[in-house]
Interface confidence: medium
């Protein structure tokens, strides 16, 4: 009386896990336990199943899988190795799985892996070789072309002693392996800064969103050699101004859209190149949005409508004459 | 016909160990993961353990997680129950269970049981 | 743990009447999908038999009198006219996650 289910929809399976690979295959219409399959559309989800670990019973046909909303905690090294090895899967959705430790070699095995998503997990521990896979100083190229990293950041009072910042760029950087990335999300992650190696270190880049963070600067970060950038997001930074450098580099990049709403422009005499270029370029997404934050008397402005006479600078009193 | 006999039970005392089988027969064993359910005297049913049909993956109850180990051999068509430091709360018919490999439709066929019988 | 509410406890219907056995989960048991809710019948001495699938899938050989609807957290197992050979205690479960769990069971008696 065992049921049949056509290839076209979801089939399923369903409870519980340990060991690690699998010494047989798992037999080709076999759909891990607590999971959803459709070998039809090479798709395998189990999500919101409180998943501790990976299933290790995974199908070889798995294209796309959906691990979210699970409690996995630590994805080991070689977490998605199978014997045979899951070479068609591309694209892995790992979000809001309660993952807090990444190791090296996590991804490994994994030769088609085109897309992984870590988003809203609170990684305390991202291996620098979690995506590279080897501690070596020039690794073999990863398959990523989208790594999806938003709102990674673990609560501040589980943060090791290091630069949130430096642990997600050692992993970026690491053996050169992200050569071919061409999408990088980093969106609401609280970085302060952007360690100005990082970008110069993937070439390939179309699209970055470093959205929703706390930026105050891009004074040190370099865009020039991103000649395939197509979309920079800084939506909800903390940025006060862009300089003639940043202007200029942005200005270079001959397929840029850049996005700039909801940043806390000064508008001094600081934010005079920048409203001049504004008031020319094409990049800016939304230009008329952008609006003045300070000085108290200039908020809300729009800065397209603002001319040099708008923008003043206090002059600086000498040490004589200031007050506390 | 599919059919499931479960044996090895038995009466038993606190601290000691069983041992029980579940012979399989009128399908290919190994193609279904399978369960361990139990029914304490005069109780209802609480789901034991799980082993997929290639030995891969393994889910316990946390009352027998440590305790339990679930196996199976596919050359003998045969499920195993290994139960160490048993305890008078482990008094229960334990039934095996088969799956099918798609796993949203319940546990399809049952064995009669065995019965285990903790007590000093 | 997902927690299996069933009601009521014992049920008493006369012959040929409908009897109906209602079964909360604490969470959604149901994807977009599926509903991964299952129900057995048990008779004294015998081990359960499942009779509905999926919440609502017949097993094959049980009689069209029975009955499973419902999705998320509630479910319903409908007899819609009770025969003697229907005595027996009913159960729900589910296989949405680890640990599976069961309903406490219904009693069904001929009135």
């Known amino acids: 009386s065992s049921p049949t289910s056509s290839a076209s929809s979801f089939s399923s399976s369903a409870p519980f896990l340990a060991s690690a690979v699998s010494a047989q295959p798992p037999l080709p219409d076999q759909c891990p336990a607590l999971c959803e399959c459709s070998e039809a559309a090479r798709t395998v989800k189990c999500v919101n199943r409180n998943l501790t670990e990976v299933p290790t019973d995974l199908p070889a046909y798995v294209r796309n899988l959906f691990l979210t909303g699970n409690q996995l905690a630590v994805l080991p090294a070689g977490a998605f190795a199978r014997r045979p090895p899951l070479a068609e899967l591309a694209a892995l959705n790992l979000s809001g799985s309660r993952l807090d430790e990444v190791r090296a070699g996590a991804f490994e095995h994994l030769p088609s892996l085109r897309q992984l998503d870590l988003s809203h997990n609170p990684l305390a521990d991202l291996s620098p070789f979690a995506f590279s896979g080897s501690n070596a100083s020039v690794s073999a190229p990863s398959p990523l072309v989208e790594l999806i990293l938003n709102h990674i950041v673990p609560p501040e009072d589980e943060r090791q002693n290091r630069s949130f910042e430096g642990m997600v760029v050692a992993a970026l950087l690491a053996g050169r392996a992200l050569q071919g990335l061409r999408r990088l999300e980093l969106a609401s992650n609280h970085f302060l800064y952007l360690p100005r190696d990082v970008l110069a270190q993937l070439p390939s880049l179309r699209h970055l969103d470093l959205s929703n963070n706390s930026l105050v600067s891009l004074t040190y970060v370099s865009f020039r050699n991103l000649t395939h950038l197509e979309s920079l997001h800084l939506e909800d930074n903390a940025l006060k101004v862009l300089h003639n450098g940043t202007l200029a580099e942005l200005q270079g990049l001959p397929h840029i859209r850049v996005f700039l709403d909801n940043n806390p422009w000064v508008c001094d005499c600081h934010m005079a190149d920048m409203v001049t270029w504004l008031k020319e370029t094409e990049v800016v997404q939304g230009k008329d949005r952008l609006t003045c934050a300070y000085p108290e008397k200039m908020r809300n402005r729009v800065l397209l409508e603002l001319n040099s006479a708008d923008l003043d600078c206090d002059p600086i009193l000498p040490p004589s004459l200031q007050t506390s | 016909e599919v059919q499931l006999v479960e044996s090895g039970g038995g009466v038993v005392q606190p601290g000691r160990s069983l041992r029980l089988s579940c012979a399989a027969s009128?399908?290919?064993?190994?193609?279904?993961?399978m369960h361990w359910v139990r029914q304490a005297p005069g109780k209802g049913l609480e789901w034991v353990a799980y082993i997929s049909s290639g030995s891969s993956t393994f889910y316990y109850a946390d009352s027998v997680k440590g305790r339990f180990t679930i196996s199976r051999d596919n050359s003998k068509n045969t499920l195993y129950l290994q139960m160490n430091s048993l305890r008078a709360e482990d008094t229960a018919v334990y039934f095996c269970?088969?799956?099918?490999?798609?796993?949203?439709?319940?546990?399809?066929?049952w064995g009669q049981g065995t019965t285990v019988t903790v007590s000093s | 743990d997902i927690v299996m509410t069933q009601s009521p406890d014992s049920l008493a219907v006369s012959l040929g009447e409908r009897a109906t056995i209602n079964c909360r989960a604490s969470?959604?048991?149901?994807?977009?999908?599926?509903?991964?809710m299952h129900w057995y019948q048990q008779k004294p001495g015998q081990p359960p038999k499942l009779l509905i699938k999926s919440s609502s899938n017949l097993e094959s050989g049980v009689p069209d009198r029975f009955s499973g609807s419902g999705s998320g957290t509630d479910f319903t197992l409908t007899i819609s006219s009770l025969q003697a050979e229907d005595v027996a205690v009913y159960y729900c479960?589910?296989?949405?996650?680890?640990?599976?769990?069961f309903g406490g069971g219904t009693k069904v008696e001929i009135k």
């Open positions: 009128g399908f290919t064993f190994s193609n279904f993961g």
């Open positions: 269970a088969r799956s099918p490999a798609y796993y949203r439709y319940g546990l399809d066929y």
């Open positions: 969470q959604s048991v149901s994807s977009s999908t599926f509903s991964y």
């Open positions: 479960q589910h296989s949405w996650e680890i640990p599976y769990t």
